[in-house]
């Protein structure tokens, strides 16, 4: 039960006080008690419940009321059952007794009022009055947890605006309101109560730039909403009529959780006594609601795809045809960024990552815009953000970034359990160097901090700086599976490729050619690849790098060897000993449900079939997956990327609610 104020009573004159329903009010009967008195009794109106703690009754009065010793250890508390119809209509009488003096009476006139700030603390999508039931001042995780949730209003419901909805002080329409969380102030007071009292709604100064609160006028259009709290206004005096009244507020978050902001915002209503104009206003009562800002959540390859993105560039029509066919098979919407908008930047995966935010009443896809800012710089903000599609970015917008700040270097695992700890939304994966050095690359700290601060997909740092491009999607992917953990981790594997090529040579296919059918590309015989000592050394190094990640992933995702599939792949070390795929990198695939768009490797054709394609199909088809090999050689592969790098996917949010987990 909420804490009320302390009321001191004195026999000299009647005391007038306000008691808020649902609060426990302390009654100080000792400090002003007559000197010779040693005990007391209390009588109260039916609407007042008196509770006296400590010690048995000293003596029973004939009237049936008990007397208690006048002792500082005796605690007297009051609660009120109903709101007052008029000021001071509830009475408490204290009678003091002494051995030689007649009883002395002290009178207390109470006004019972109902004041409660309600939000959806039960996370049902509805605001229910919770007076005296739950402590709204704490926010707890888990299925039995409580506490309200706020969305960052980061979409753009007004198509004529270039800004996010949370960047203005206006409520556009009912669409805009739906992105906000409802909070209701319920009051029930005597008619004249607010002539001597005031209500003020406020937020801590440290949180005022993270939230905006609009006050709605009931029964009027949403355009009647006016801002009452926000970056410029930490407090607001409310004009409340007496009697029974409800006031609606709509709350939007302005910032995602981050290093300097844990994501919690407390809104407080304070009741002030303004009856004495000579004195400052006195606080009578406070009620608070704590909100947590919904985190940005990534979706793994195992979530159903809803929309595919790709770029149209010079001569990639065939690639786009393949992606279109795949999207149709997976029943996905397809969005193509035209040449004039991508400015010859085809790397859709690197520019953005599409996740979502969720409150009990609303789920919103949100695009996380990387700071790489090349030709596709404007695409997320101009073409992706919109009505019910949010936007967030982090990191320096001009310079100070590396290749590891592109979002091919940002992936998320499917849900996992690791040594008994559940990650029901999976874990974020990104690449880093294995140790810092003068020229090593790492994901910008601002990005790392943002990802960690979301709390619900605890990040795992992998080692990717050994790659020329340096992205985790160059050596790993996840595909759905019908058994075990519901997925398989795919890892690029030079060892597996050498084993396959050796088997083919042993069967007399040493003359079979890699890159056959590719114009202007020097073809390589299996036997020459197997006999090239330098290439072997390069791939031995690559294997060690991937194996390091393999063990890291097994440990941090709780995987067994049987959860991992090795995809045959060779690499070569180029300048500064950075690795690039020797032939199109098959692990860099587009996963659309059971439909996989895999870079066509142009491997040695044996008995009319590419042995690399055949091997990959034999590994993946038993899982119910359909492999489509896409020719990306000249349009993507030779430009240091593949199918996954050149595409992006919006996926269905998890059915699991993030607030039900315990980070």
């Amino acid at each position: 039960m909420a804490q009320g104020t302390l009321i001191r009573v004195t026999p000299e004159q009647p005391t007038h006080a306000v008691c808020v329903l649902g609060t426990l009010t302390q009654l100080d009967i000792c400090s002003s008690a007559p000197e010779d008195c040693t005990s007391f009794s209390i009588n109260a109106s039916p609407g007042v419940v008196v509770d006296i703690a400590h010690g048995p009754p000293a003596k029973k009065k004939s009237t049936g009321s008990s007397t208690w010793p006048l002792d500082p250890g005796v605690e007297v508390t009051l609660t009120m059952k109903v709101a007052s119809g008029s000021t001071g209509d509830q009475k408490v009488q204290i009678s003091y007794y002494g051995p030689k003096t007649p009883p002395v009476k002290a009178l207390l006139y109470l006004t019972g009022v109902e004041i409660s700030l309600c939000a959806d603390i039960t996370r049902t999508g509805k605001v229910k009055p919770t007076r005296a039931v739950k402590d709204q001042r704490t926010w707890t995780w888990g299925p039995c947890g409580q506490g309200a949730i706020l969305l960052v209003n980061c979409d753009r419901d007004n198509l004529e605006s270039s800004a996010m909805d949370c960047e203005d002080d206006e409520v556009l329409d009912s669409e805009d309101l739906q992105d906000m969380s409802l909070m209701t102030l319920s009051t029930k007071t005597p008619k004249d109560f607010f002539t001597n009292h005031t209500l003020v709604l406020h937020v801590a100064r440290s949180e005022m730039d993270k939230v905006r609160v609009f006050q709605a006028t009931r029964g009027k259009l949403s355009s009647k909403c006016s801002v009452v709290l926000g970056p410029k206004w930490p407090s607001h005096y409310l004009m409340v009529p007496g009697g029974k009244h409800n006031m609606d507020f709509y709350v939007e978050a302005l910032a995602f959780p981050d290093t300097d902001f844990p994501g919690l915002i407390t809104l407080t209503i304070s009741l002030l006594d303004t009856s004495n104009l000579e004195l400052p206003e006195a606080v009578v009562f406070q009620d608070s609601v704590v909100f947590r800002v919904a985190p940005w959540i990534m979706t793994p390859n195992t979530q159903p795809p809803q929309e595919v993105y790709a770029c149209s560039i010079f001569e990639n029509e065939d690639f786009l045809k393949s992606v279109t066919t795949l999207a149709m098979k997976a029943k996905c919407k397809l969005t193509i960024c035209p040449e004039e908008e991508n400015m010859d930047d085809q790397w859709m995966q690197d520019e953005m990552e599409i996740g979502y935010i969720q409150a009990p009443h609303k789920t919103l896809p949100v695009v996380f815009d990387s700071p790489r800012n090349r030709g596709l710089k404007e695409f997320p903000i101009k073409r992706v953000m919109g009505p019910d599609f949010g936007y967030v970015t982090r990191g320096p917008q001009t310079g100070g970034i590396s290749g590891l700040d592109s979002f091919g270097n940002l992936e998320v695992s499917p849900p996992v359990t690791v040594r008994g700890k559940e990650y029901p939304l999976g874990r974020i994966l990104f690449g880093d160097s294995c140790y810092p050095s003068n020229d090593s690359r790492q994901m910008h700290q601002a990005l790392q901090d943002f990802l960690s601060a979301q709390q619900v997909q605890a990040p795992v740092k992998l080692y990717s700086d050994w790659l020329s491009v340096g992205h985790v999607d160059e050596f790993l992917s996840f595909v759905p599976a019908p058994d075990r953990k519901g997925f398989r981790l795919l890892l690029a594997s030079p060892r597996s490729c050498y084993k396959l090529f050796q088997e083919q040579q042993n069967e007399g296919h040493g003359e079979a050619l890699l890159f056959e059918g590719i114009k202007k590309k020097k073809q390589q015989k299996i036997k020459n690849i197997l006999s090239n000592k330098t290439l072997r050394e390069h791939n031995s190094f690559v294997e060690r790098c991937i194996d390091w990640n393999r063990e890291l992933l097994k440990r941090e995702l709780g995987l067994a060897e049987s959860d991992i599939i090795d995809i045959p792949q060779l690499f070569k070390l180029k300048e500064f000993s950075k690795a690039e795929a020797f032939f199109p990198n098959m692990v860099n695939m587009l996963v659309l449900g059971k439909h996989l768009g895999i870079p066509k490797p142009f491997g040695p054709v044996i008995n009319g079939r590419c042995c690399l394609e055949e091997k990959v199909c034999s590994l993946l088809e038993p899982l119910g997956l359909q492999c489509t090999f896409i020719n990306d050689f000249f349009t993507y592969h030779i430009r240091h990327g593949e199918v996954h790098c050149g595409t992006n996917v919006r996926r269905k949010p998890f059915s699991f609610k993030w607030w039900n987990m315990v980070p």
Epitope: R374, S402, G403, S406, S437, N438, D439, R441, S468, V469, G470, K521, K522, Q524, N528, I529, N532, T534, L535, H538, K572, L573, K574, E575, F576, K578, F582, I638, R639, H640
Partner: antibody
């Protein structure tokens, strides 16, 4: 073959900044590694910085690390060298050089470590 | 103080051969086959004449040849001609924190 032209040099006070540009013609610069090399008056060559063709990693000499930034805009066929906190000892002719990344060997040779195409250079003078 | 050591000057008569040495360490010349040589005439930009220790770009006469032994690389110019008079610089990839090193340069005089 690609031709390179440097620009942006000039006189600057110590502590000041300059941005050098290296514009390419005759070929697409996105197929090339690019390095900046400088030569102080009457002195030898000093390697300054490198950016790979994929625009995914960079390297710097100890003498400029933290002050200079190499970047590229493949759409503009240009590589840049942003020079901040300039010192008198940065006075030199700055050359832009490149090597083609389009290699067909099983194992690519070290084309990032040598410079087969050079621009004519641009003079940077740091003096108060 | 250059990281790779070259003689300040060498000279030879037309038709003769000269060799310019370039000494590094186990962390650069000794470790990598990424040694290159450049010719620079006064007031001009350098020109690549040898890469990967001994390979010649197209258009460079076969009078120019490169080799390496241990931590020392060498450039040999046979059948010296007047137009060979120039400064010559060696360069190597390095394990050090500056990944490409140059020598201090050698002035070749054709007598």
């Amino acid at each position: 073959q690609v031709q390179l032209v440097e620009s942006g040099g000039g006189l600057v006070k110590p502590g000041g900044s300059l941005r050098l540009s290296c514009a390419a013609s005759g070929s697409t610069l996105s197929d090339y590694f690019v390095s900046w090399i400088r030569q102080a008056p009457g002195k030898g060559l000093e390697w300054v910085s490198f950016i790979n063709a994929a625009n995914t990693f960079t390297y710097y000499a100890d003498s400029v690390r933290g002050r200079f930034t190499i970047s590229r805009d493949n759409a503009k066929n240009t590589v840049y060298l942003q020079m901040n906190s300039l010192r008198a000892e940065d006075t030199a002719v700055y050359y832009c050089s490149s090597a083609n990344d389009d290699v067909d060997d099983i194992v690519a040779p070290g084309r990032g470590y040598y410079m087969d195409v050079w621009g004519r250079g641009t003079l940077v003078t740091v003096s108060s | 103080q250059s990281a790779l050591t070259q003689p300040r000057s060498v000279s030879g008569s037309p038709g003769q051969s000269v060799t310019i040495s370039c000494t590094g360490t186990r962390g650069d010349v000794g470790r990598y086959n990424h040694v290159s040589w450049y010719q620079q005439h006064p007031g001009k930009a350098p020109k690549l004449i040898i890469y990967n220790v001994y390979e010649r770009p197209s258009g460079v006469p076969d009078r120019f040849s490169g080799s390496k032994s241990g931590n020392t690389a060498s450039l040999t110019i046979s059948g010296l001609q007047a137009e060979d008079e120039a400064d010559y610089y060696c360069s190597s990839h390095s394990r050090s924190s500056t990944p490409v090193l140059f020598g201090g340069g050698t002035k070749l005089t054709v007598l």
